[in-house]
């Protein structure tokens, strides 16, 4: 019970093209210390969607204030969804390391499907 778990409550989310997609993720613990990252896909070829620590992600906004003390909600919203955004998104907790952070635990993934824009 005490070990950190990564909760991605929706296994699938369907969004119309042009809309925003909210991908929910929360941690059950503040420990271990380290950043959260969102990826599309798994394995070596996965694509970084959001890095809590650094980087510029113009289409991504965080749902809650990540700098807030004791925040455990790392949900994100991706704007202006297109069919190219379809895929499975993983919320991943990293453990702070030196020189590099180490992947600690991943959520189960949320499959994003994109519907045609209503005419």
């Amino acid at each position: 019970e005490d070990e950190l778990q990564v909760i991605q409550p929706e296994k699938s989310v369907s969004v119309a093209a042009g809309e925003s997609a909210t991908l929910r993720c929360a941690m059950t613990s503040l420990i271990p210390v380290g950043p959260i990252m969102w990826f599309r896909g798994a394995g070596a070829g996965r694509e970084l969607i959001y890095n809590q620590k650094e980087g510029h992600f113009p289409r991504v906004t965080t749902v809650s204030e990540l700098t807030k003390r004791n925040n455990l909600d790392f949900s994100i919203s991706i704007s202006n969804i297109t069919p190219a955004d379809a895929g499975t998104y993983y919320c991943v907790k990293f453990r702070k390391g030196s020189p590099d952070d180490v992947e600690f635990k991943s959520g189960a993934g949320t499959e994003l499907s994109v519907r045609a824009k209503p005419s």
């Epitope: 019970e1 778990q5 990564v6 909760i7 296994k11 699938s12 929360a26 909600d73 189960a108 993934g109």
Partner: antibody
């Protein structure tokens, strides 16, 4: 072991609201989805919505959207379901339910309903 | 929303005999991790529902091994190898792949 204790039976007038509580004991409260399921007399089970307290916001079935509010108070390990604009068709037994452990987190299986409350009977009558 | 269809509506059984209930979903409940997000519940008369089978084929804690779940994708079956008198009640399947969770209409199992 995990237990869910629900508030007592209610009799309400059409157009009014009802708020049913569900207190969890045993296990961690914040990390588990609490679902609310209702059963009208002689009818089947109907999922109204659910909340994982750690997120603060709930998911609702479209049928109840705008009429139901599900909340959770982490300080008392209690979930609430409020249904407004009551009509006679809302006469039912309302259950809360939740999973018991986190072993299936890695599978994304959050809405398991291993443990159920005994149900709260809500009667809507003029 | 995913539509769940159960059959039969009513199932008269003889104690000691096997019984089978079918559940069909309007879309596949098989997720990319290989699990089917389909659960089975039994509601005995005057009681709250109780979980029998989760993720398609896994027996819940304390559930007798005469209960088994099978199937994948859109077609699922709950089998009782030898029905006992205490097994009477209404059986429901429910999909847990996505919210809103949706239940089948129920199958009432009664002793002949």
């Amino acid at each position: 072991q995990v237990q869910l204790v629900q508030s007592g039976a209610e009799v309400k007038k059409p157009g009014s609201s009802v708020k049913v509580s569900c207190k969890a004991s045993g296990g961690t409260f914040s990390n588990y989805a609490i679902s609310w399921v209702r059963q009208a007399p002689g009818q089947g089970l109907e999922w109204m919505g659910g909340i994982i307290p750690i997120f603060g916001t709930a998911n609702y079935a479209q049928k109840f959207q705008g009429r139901v509010t599900i909340t959770a108070d982490e300080s008392t390990s209690t979930a609430y379901m409020e249904l407004s604009s009551l009509r006679s068709e809302d006469t039912a037994v309302y259950y809360c339910a939740r999973p018991v452990d986190s072993s299936s987190y890695s599978l994304g299986y959050y809405y398991g309903m291993d443990v159920w409350g005994k149900g709260t009977t809500v009667t809507v009558s003029s | 929303d995913i539509v769940m269809t159960q059959s039969p509506l009513s199932l008269p059984v003889t104690p000691g005999e096997p019984a089978s209930i079918s559940c069909r979903s309007s879309q596949s409940l098989l997720y990319s991790n290989g699990y089917n997000y389909l659960d089975w519940y039994l509601q005995k008369p005057g009681q709250s529902p109780q979980l029998l089978i989760y993720l398609g084929s896994n027996r819940a804690s304390g559930v007798p091994d005469r209960f088994s779940g099978s199937g994948s994708g859109t077609d699922f079956t709950l089998k009782i190898s030898r029905v006992e008198a205490e097994d009477v009640g209404v059986y429901y399947c429910v999909q847990a792949l996505q919210t809103p969770l949706t239940f089948g209409g129920g199958t009432k199992v009664e002793i002949k």
